[in-house]
């Protein structure tokens, strides 16, 4: 009763197509698969960024897999062949592992890479990234930004840099078609006459860095003697009403300050008969139903009402 063995996949490699972190893992079928012609061979693939505690595990029948990685760190992957139990009259048979690693050969001391990279997707319309130059770099250093997301056939360079003293310190992106809810990859590299500059890689999803415009048209009506209804409108732009969460800051008679979070464009407030004046501001953010994260908008303009005037309107 001979033991059934299977070879690992051949030519396992990690290929960088130039998409700034989106890599291809590819391989060829193992040698000597003739004995298992009737079998559907599967592959178990494990991969991670070096330094990560956990492996991502994929079982596939394909000869390739694609995923995003942090190119600031190395990547390691391993794969083995799986023969399902149907092929072996018993238990599943696994080959030994084939292994592959990949990293961008660095240049430049780490301090030369850009500092404090910050990207904001204003009102889900305009992406702007800004950074500070690396520590100790001279004014002859210039940084260049490249970006890619699925849908572009190659990485593109920024065409509209924000400059200070001739040095690129940010990028205004053009309209980015179908770019949300997918990984957006950025590389900022640099050049200098005096020293090599370290590249930096960043990955995020645009819907998670949206900063909306503040709400507009703040109004206030007295619903009953001790109830005031605050209302506002969603800001102009592509963000649907269902995607907003709001924070309201209410001040009664310059003393009591109430901050509360609501999910729609109204808020009913209980007041006392001592209340003379009411002021409020609102800001907006993309909610958890539309993104995993977001940035609060600026506060709206402050609106104030005399409660006595509101009461007169109500009585009329």
């Amino acid at each position: 009763d001979t033991e059934i063995k299977v070879n690992p996949p051949q030519d396992f490699e990690i290929v960088d197509p130039g998409y700034l972190g989106y890599l291809y893992l590819q391989w060829q079928p193992p040698l000597s698969l003739d004995n298992f012609k009737e079998c559907t061979v599967e592959y178990e693939l494990k991969y991670r960024n070096i330094g990560s505690e956990t492996w991502t595990t994929i079982i596939t029948k394909n000869l390739h897999y694609k995923d995003g990685f942090d190119l600031n760190k190395g990547i390691e992957a391993k794969i083995h062949t799986l023969l399902p139990w149907q092929c072996t009259n018993g238990s599943e048979v696994q080959s030994s592992w084939a292994e592959a690693t990949y990293w961008i050969s660095p240049q430049g001391i780490p301090e030369t890479k850009v500092q404090d990279m910050d990207c904001v997707y204003y009102n889900w319309q305009y992406l702007l990234c800004s950074w500070k130059p690396g520590i100790g770099v001279l004014l002859d250093t210039n940084y260049n930004l490249f970006y890619w997301y699925e849908g572009l056939d190659r990485a593109l360079q920024c065409v509209d840099y924000i400059k200070v003293d001739g040095q690129n310190i940010g990028c205004r992106f053009p309209y980015l078609e179908s770019s949300d809810y997918k990984d957006f990859y950025i590389c900022v590299n640099g050049s200098s006459e005096t020293k090599p500059i370290r590249s930096s890689y960043f990955t995020f999803q645009l819907q998670n860095i949206v900063k909306p415009l503040p709400p507009v048209c703040l109004t206030c009506t007295q619903e009953s003697l001790y109830e005031i209804k605050l209302k506002w409108s969603i800001p102009l732009g592509p963000i649907p009403a269902r995607c907003f969460v709001y924070e309201i800051e209410i001040r009664e008679d310059d003393t009591t300050l109430v901050t509360t979070t609501v999910e729609n464009e109204t808020y009913t407030l209980k007041i006392t008969n001592e209340t003379r004046q009411l002021c409020f501001v609102v800001r907006s953010k993309v909610n958890i139903y539309c993104s995993d994260d977001g940035i609060w908008s600026e506060w709206s303009d402050k609106q104030c009402w005399e409660v006595e005037e509101l009461l007169k309107k109500t009585l009329l």
Epitope: I50, G51, G74, P106, Q107, G108, I109, P110, E111, G136
Partner: antibody
Framework: QVQLKESGPGLVAPSQSLSINCTVS????????VHWIRQSPGKGLEWLGV???????DYNSALMSRLTISKDNNKSQVFLKMNSLQSDDSAMYYC??????????WGQGTSVTVSS | QVVLTQSPAIMSASPGERVTMTCTAS???????LHWYHQKPGSSPKLWIY???NLASGVPARFSGSGSGTSYSLTISSMEAEDAATYYC?????????FGSGTKLELK
């Protein structure tokens, strides 16, 4: 397996220049950078510079005017040249492989004495 | 440049004893770029702990490293004779790259 081996003149006269070769095996200079470090009782471990895999170079600014680091990828060799040597340049000179922002393999070092 | 100050300069420990040595940086250094090297007389330095707390290949599990910002340390949970050596901290964050002056650990 990964190896680095320095070879130098041993003795150098004051004001003369120093040339040291670092011959590597077990890895490619197109994938890994190589650092030069020296060690003396007076100054401890002192980083001199690095030749990156892509061909660019970083130097210790205090020594930059006297240093040149070059390499030959095909011969798997990295070269250190230092001009105008003085007695305080006497040290053990090491080359070391750069790997993920650390120096993971070092050569055995070559001793350099500056004396007339 | 970043000056790394190691203390103590020399220390001795008995087998089984817990040993801690420190490295203080004059400027903040990212923990990713703070490493420790081990050197015995007549040998070249060996990478011992990388990125503050990761043991290099072949380093016994009794070694550990910790720290952040300007303060880092290397600890041996239970001293063994073979641990007698000089230990250097090294920062790879800012140019020029610098090393501490070393802590010489002797067997008592």
């Amino acid at each position: 397996q990964v190896q680095l081996k320095e070879s130098g003149p041993g003795l150098v006269a004051p004001s003369q220049s120093l040339s040291i070769n670092c011959t590597v095996s077990g890895f490619s200079l197109t994938k890994y950078g190589v650092h030069w470090i020296r060690q003396s009782p007076g100054k401890g471990l002192e980083w001199l510079g690095v030749k990156w895999a892509g061909g660019s170079t970083d130097y210790n600014s205090a020594l930059m005017s006297r240093l040149t680091i070059s390499k030959d990828n095909n011969k798997s060799q990295v070269f250190l040249k230092m001009n105008s040597l003085q007695s305080d340049d006497s040290a053990m000179y090491y080359c070391a492989r750069d790997h993920r922002d650390a120096m993971d393999y070092w050569g055995q070092g070559t001793s350099v004495t500056v004396s007339s | 440049q970043v000056v790394l100050t190691q203390s103590p300069a020399i220390m001795s420990a008995s087998p089984g004893e817990r040993v801690t040595m420190t490295c203080t940086a004059s400027l903040s250094v990212s923990s990713t770029y703070l490493h420790w090297y081990h050197q015995k007389p007549g040998s070249s330095p060996k990478l011992w702990i990388y990125s503050t707390s990761n043991l290099a290949s072949g380093v016994p599990a009794r070694f550990s490293g910790s720290g952040s910002g300007t303060s880092y340390s290397l600890t041996i949970s239970s001293m063994e004779a073979e641990d007698a050596a000089t230990y250097y901290c090294h920062q790879y964050h800012r140019s020029p790259l610098t090393f501490g002056s070393g802590t010489k650990l002797e067997l008592k």
